[in-house]
Interface confidence: low
């Protein structure tokens, strides 16, 4: 597995935007053709979505299990770009696609946004404040 190009998670604010020139901005990390911004601020799910958009990137998405294992091993828990309109609706990604995994606690009607934690995805209240990370595909 390719590992981190940079592994210094300093608490300095990272305001650089992901660029499209084939490599990641300074202090973003690289894994399998994607750049990841390691957030430090806590925000609601919607605020996190907007914060990532402002960095020309997307709220963290999980494309496969290998990526999930990699991210869970190096990142603090965070929002991911998965939500549902209610407990009667399916989980979907921010691109509108059906989400590929079952989510912990998903039968609780108040928990409609998804969080990545160690070894697991779980649901949480969208209005609660959580760390967020962003992703940009090279």
């Amino acid at each position: 597995i390719p590992f981190l190009e940079q592994n210094n998670f300093s608490p300095n604010t990272r305001t650089q935007k992901a660029r499209h020139c084939g490599h990641c901005p300074e202090e973003w990390i690289t894994y399998s053709n994607s750049c990841y911004y390691i957030g430090k601020e806590r925000r609601t799910w919607e605020e996190s979505l907007l914060a990532c958009t402002s960095k020309n990137s997307s709220l963290l998405s999980i494309d496969n299990e290998e990526e999930m294992k990699f991210l869970a091993s190096i990142l603090p828990s965070s929002w991911i770009g998965v939500f549902r309109n209610s407990s009667h609706h399916p989980w979907v990604t921010i691109n509108g696609l059906a989400f590929k995994h079952k989510i912990k606690d998903s039968d609780n009607a108040e928990l409609n946004c998804a969080v990545l934690q160690v070894n697991r995805l779980k649901s949480a209240q969208c209005g609660s404040s959580m760390i967020y990370h962003c992703k940009h595909k090279l």
Partner: antibody
Framework: EVQLQQSGAELVKPGASVTLSCTAS????????MHWVQQRPEQGLEWIGR????????KYDPNFQGKATITADTSSNTAYLQLSSLTSEDTAVYHC????????????WGAGTTVTVSS | NIMMTQSPSSLAVSAGEKVTMSCKSS????????????LAWYQQKPGQSPKLLIY???TRESGVPDRFTGSGSGTDFTLTITNIQAEDLAVYYC????????FGGGTKLEIK
């Protein structure tokens, strides 16, 4: 090493209750679901229920609703199964197992606890 | 609940032979979103607890010999064991984990 250590065998009288324990080592139960599975003598495996130790949320097979109560103590990294109003039908080996979200299958099992209900 | 049916309930083979056992689910355990079959196989040796052999219907658990192979999709699944060894004496259970959790009744493998 990832392990589940179960409490010792129990001999109990009909009508009584019993509580079995399952202590995890090598991982934090808060990161998993903890399950209990019944195996009657010379029979197959029956899922009893599970707990999310992080928040105490439980789910049971309808056949065990009212019979089984699953709890967890994250400070001791232990899951518990309480069986009430015991009858001879409850004589069985009770296994604990863990599953991880995203994966869901039972990748680690305890050695099992034998419960014998007899007067 | 999804019902799991295993066959045969028992079989006896000689060391070195190949065996196949079947598991059928009452409804599909294929999750359309990720095209994964939520089906596992366990081996339970006499006096022991079950041990995970196969998950996602065909992925071998770490440390499991490649003599054990899982196959199938949807509702029909097979566990194949080649070059049977004396230590393979056990009951083999299939298990669906898509909708709650249910196990098959088991197939008991005996060595002639």
């Amino acid at each position: 090493e990832v392990q589940l250590q179960q409490s010792g065998a129990e001999l109990v009288k009909p009508g009584a209750s019993v509580t079995l324990s399952c202590t995890a080592s090598g991982f934090n139960i808060k990161d998993t679901y903890m399950h209990w599975v019944q195996q009657r003598p010379e029979q197959g495996l029956e899922w009893i229920g599970r707990i999310d130790p992080e928040n105490g949320y439980t789910k049971y097979d309808p056949n065990f609703q009212g019979k089984a109560t699953i709890t967890a103590d994250t400070s001791s990294n232990t899951a518990y199964l309480q069986l009430s109003s015991l009858t001879s039908e409850d004589t069985a080996v009770y296994h604990c197992a863990r599953s991880r979200t995203l994966f869901w299958y039972f990748d680690v099992w305890g050695a099992g606890t034998t419960v014998t209900v007899s007067s | 609940n999804i019902m799991m049916t295993q066959s045969p309930s028992s079989l006896a083979v000689s060391a070195g032979e190949k065996v196949t056992m079947s598991c059928k689910s009452s409804q599909s355990v294929l999750y359309s979103s990720n095209q994964k079959n939520y089906l596992a196989w366990y081996q339970q040796k006499p006096g022991q607890s079950p041990k995970l052999l196969i998950y996602w219907a065909s992925t071998r658990e770490s440390g499991v010999p490649d003599r054990f192979t899982g196959s199938g999709s949807g509702t029909d699944f097979t566990l194949t064991i080649t070059n049977i060894q004396a230590e393979d004496l056990a009951v083999y259970y299939c298990h669906q984990y898509l909708s709650s959790y249910t196990f098959g009744g088991g197939t008991k493998l005996e060595i002639k």
